[in-house]
Interface confidence: low
């Protein structure tokens, strides 16, 4: 018997293995990031690997446990929140997910001064939202759609609202459509900077039509889930904003903030609230036809105990080529004078840039400019403004962090991240401590993600917070696919694409091609980020080429590309995927008889329309939880891009852009349609209607439903889904199992 070493040394290739589907489903190659929970200019909290809550002081280098894992375990806490006066911690347990951001939980208050849980006047359960005041240890919480206030954790609560009612009136929390499509938060209440006032939204859903679907569960009869959900053109929620003095809440009670007259004249939305000082607040409003936004700065009138929003402090933002803003209207970042602010909006050339507004928007001073876009303003201090953009080397799918010195004239700009780890890191975000004394940089790729801590004055790296060493070691013997990001120039349109190539890719050979598409307005798929996911496996193990293409309607490349799809969803997004496929075929290494497309949500819509385009390019494709008609989707999202489904507006295109209208064209492709029956977002109705149209047209197709699963198809459904899709693609591409 000859014993052979487990590794053959004559070829490094032989020691390497391809990714497996199991690797992906088990999350074997997932990465970690480190976001400090800042509690001062130089201190942050972090939950250690063994679940202790640890306070770190950057300047002294000291760290100590403020809350032990035993205390966390005693109430099965999965989250925590330290009061600003550091006397109390809330512990969150019994997490129960509702929609994308919302969940309910049980909350316990732990007194750090005596090491005991606060007894007496305990919080009710389950609570929909809870938060500390920014100073001290006041608590605001939402229970059964009403808002309550506690001056101290052990005090009895003061009830602020009384009209809260399930599915009818929401106080301090958003209804479904505001949560998903406008605020992107689970809360709709905001403390003033020193905790004097509490602002909150009231959403009245009384007249909104309800979506109802079955939840099968385990009982003899299914439950019916009812959600007030305004579809395109339907009655919308009615929103009001109130502010209450939390020091003397019973004195005058909640005061309503007036809506600007030009907004209130027709249907409108509230889009965000930003406190400037304890006695100045900034509200943003948006017309239902979402091309006019008004930013309104309001002041507290001590004599009247009311909020005054003078017209001279109303700033109008209007788009003439599309909708206002990008995905959302941007929010202002106020400077230290408490009246001027920085905001991102389109410049005269149609690129989103930072502007400084001192008195009127007409006199705004443009801070950044160029054929690239400013993406986020992180922090404004007395002398610096930190923002992210995709300027560097003209790659729209990158993000670098910049500092503009606003304290000196002329302002100077410095890229903080461009040259730090240039090959590894091209896509950053940042998290700043108070006054930007320190900040953390989180790099998402294209190399293995890394999080680092930096000095806010010098930008010097202080330490590595997380470098994913274990992941790096685990990947050493994995044959990862190659990735390239390039662009196609077609008819004056730039189509950026990411191509994921098999490890032993050979340009002289022919490979099956899978297009992965999302393509929704203001989205971006071609990004310089690290990922080991399903498509990595398909390239590594199954030898497919995968491509992602950012076509018209996608973000961060200027308004011409972004607003091209305005009022015409489902046209150019599809055209551009098809155009890219034709270009890929011209490259010579694609087997044009084996081309597939797949997408989820908006991507499911685009993949369905691409398959039904009649081009003959695609052999097969998959749509997961697709939109099939814009009349079935949420008003706030749909109308932003499509207008209203009325005869005098855009009904014709609503009707022309459905998947069902193209049922006949699915005859010559293999189509796999997948949807969760409890999808609160893109309702199962969408796929039910596609299936009905295909059956009526006598077109064969494959389908899979996931009982009681929502838009995310999580848990065991995920494993089943990817296994099922893998079999479908391998069969389509004639790959052996």
């Amino acid at each position: 018997i000859v014993l052979r070493p487990s590794r053959v040394h004559n070829s490094e290739e032989n020691t390497m293995r391809a990714l497996t589907l199991k690797d992906i489903l088990n999350g074997t190659f997932s990465y970690k990031t480190f976001f400090p929970n800042w509690i001062s200019g130089q201190e942050y909290l972090h939950q250690s690997a063994d679940n202790n809550i640890v306070l770190y002081n950057i300047e002294t280098g000291q760290s100590y446990t403020i809350l032990s894992n035993r205390t966390m375990k005693s109430v099965n806490a999965s989250n925590y929140g330290l009061s600003p006066d550091r006397q109390f911690v809330y512990l969150e347990s019994d997490y129960s997910k509702l929609w994308r951001y919302s969940y309910t939980a049980t909350y316990y208050i732990y007194d750090l001064s005596n090491g005991e849980f606060v007894r007496g006047n305990e919080l009710p359960r389950p609570i929909q939202y809870l938060c500390w005041s920014p100073v001290g240890s006041k608590l605001a919480y939402v229970y059964q759609n009403n808002i309550y206030l506690k001056q101290r954790p052990g005090d009895p609560p003061f009830q602020i609202t009384f009209n809260g009612r399930e599915n009818k009136i929401f106080n301090g929390i958003p209804d479904w459509v505001y949560e998903e499509e406008m605020l992107a938060t689970k809360y709709a209440l905001w403390w003033s900077p020193n905790g004097k006032f509490l602002a909150y939204a009231e959403f009245n859903d009384t007249d909104i039509p309800v979506i109802a679907y079955s939840y099968y569960g385990d009982e003899q009869y299914p439950r019916t889930i009812n959600i007030p959900y305004p579809k395109a053109g339907a009655k919308n929620p009615v929103v009001r904003i109130f502010i209450i003095d939390t020091t003397y809440p019973a004195y005058v009670g909640p005061q309503e903030v007036p809506v600007p007259a030009m907004i209130a004249s027709s249907d409108y939305y509230f889009s965000w609230l930003t406190w400037v000082t304890d006695e100045r607040v900034c509200l943003q409003w948006l017309k239902r036809v979402q091309n006019v936004s008004v930013l309104s700065i309001c002041d507290f009138r001590e004599d009247w105990q009311t909020w005054d929003c003078p017209k001279t402090q109303e700033h109008i933002e209007e788009s003439r080529t599309g909708w206002a803003g990008g995905f959302f209207v941007s929010t202002p970042v106020f400077s230290y004078d408490a009246i001027s602010y920085y905001k991102i909006f389109s410049d005269k050339d149609g690129y989103k840039h930072i502007h400084y507004i001192k008195d009127t928007v007409e006199n705004a001073i443009q801070i950044t400019s160029g054929k690239w876009e400013a993406i986020n303003i992180f922090r404004v201090t007395q002398d610096s403004l930190f923002y992210s953009s995709n300027e560097f080397e003209e790659y729209p799918g990158r993000r670098n962090i910049y500092r503009i010195s606003i304290g000196s004239y002329p302002p100077s700009k410095k890229c903080v991240t461009c040259h730090l780890r240039k090959e590894r890191c091209q896509y950053y975000t940042a998290s700043f401590s108070d006054y930007a004394k320190y900040y953390a940089l989180v790099c998402y790729g294209p190399g293995i993600p890394i999080s680092t801590l930096h000095d806010g004055r010098t930008d010097q790296e202080i330490k590595i917070l997380e470098e994913n060493k274990e992941l790096e070691n685990a990947l050493k013997n994995i044959q990862l696919p190659k990735e390239e990001i390039k662009k196609l120039e077609v008819d004056e349109i730039t189509l950026w694409y990411k191509m994921i190539l098999p490890p032993q890719f050979d340009r002289s050979k022919k490979y099956p091609l899978l297009i992965q598409v999302y393509g929704g307005p203001c989205s971006q798929s071609v990004r310089s980020v690290f990922a080991v996911n399903w498509i990595s496996y398909l390239a590594s193990k199954e030898g497919m080429v995968i491509a992602l293409v950012d076509g018209r309607g996608t973000a961060f490349q200027g308004d011409k590309l972004l607003y091209a799809v305005y009022r015409k969803l489902g046209v150019y997004e599809v055209e551009d995927q098809i155009t890219a496929v034709r270009k890929f075929i011209e490259m010579g290494f694609i087997d044009e008889k084996r081309i597939a497309i797949w997408g989820w949500s908006y991507g499911g819509y685009v993949s369905s329309l691409a398959l039904a385009s009649g081009t003959g390019l695609f052999k097969c494709g998959i749509a997961v939880a697709p939109v099939s008609s814009w009349e079935y989707y949420a008003s706030v999202y749909t109308e932003r891009f499509m207008g209203l489904p009325t005869k005098d507006d855009n009904l014709e295109h609503y009707k022309n852009s459905t998947v069902m209208a193209r049922a006949e064209y699915f005859r010559n492709v293999d189509y796999l349609l997948i949807h969760g029956t409890a999808d609160d977002n893109v309702h199962f109705q969408n796929s039910a209607q596609i299936a009905k149209a295909l059956v009526n047209a006598q077109v064969d197709f494959q389908a899979m439903w996931y009982s009681d699963q929502n838009h995310g198809l999580s848990g065991l459904s995920t494993n089943h889904l990817y296994t099922h899709m893998t079999h479908f693609l391998k069969q389509c591409f004639s790959l052996s199992d």
């Epitope: 030009m262 109008i316 209007e318 003439r320 389109s346 005269k348 007409e362 705004a364």
Partner: nanobody, 118 residues
Amino acid sequence: EVQLVESGGGLVQPGGSLRLSCAASGRTFSYNPMGWFRQAPGKGRELVAAISRTGGSTYYPDSVEGRFTISRDNAKRMVYLQMNSLRAEDTAVYYCAAGTDTWHYNYWGQGTQVTVSS
């Protein structure tokens, strides 16, 4: 480029009316929000009316609300300011202006004088 020429100014008694017109040339007119500004002697330029590109949205400061009306005719490339119940404090040079999509006014006319006096 957008060129703007105002007309219709003149002398009027308090309580009277005037209609200012602004003729625009240049191919991007219909994409521009438009505004009327005024500048009284020794004072800064003040926005008195604004209108969105479609005419669907208008804006007036409190000082002229209910008295002034802005309108536009995209086909004729004209913007109008109807001024009623004029007061002495409305005396100023009135300028027509064209903005970008966020109502930054970057094109200006030469101005027309309005004098309200008995």
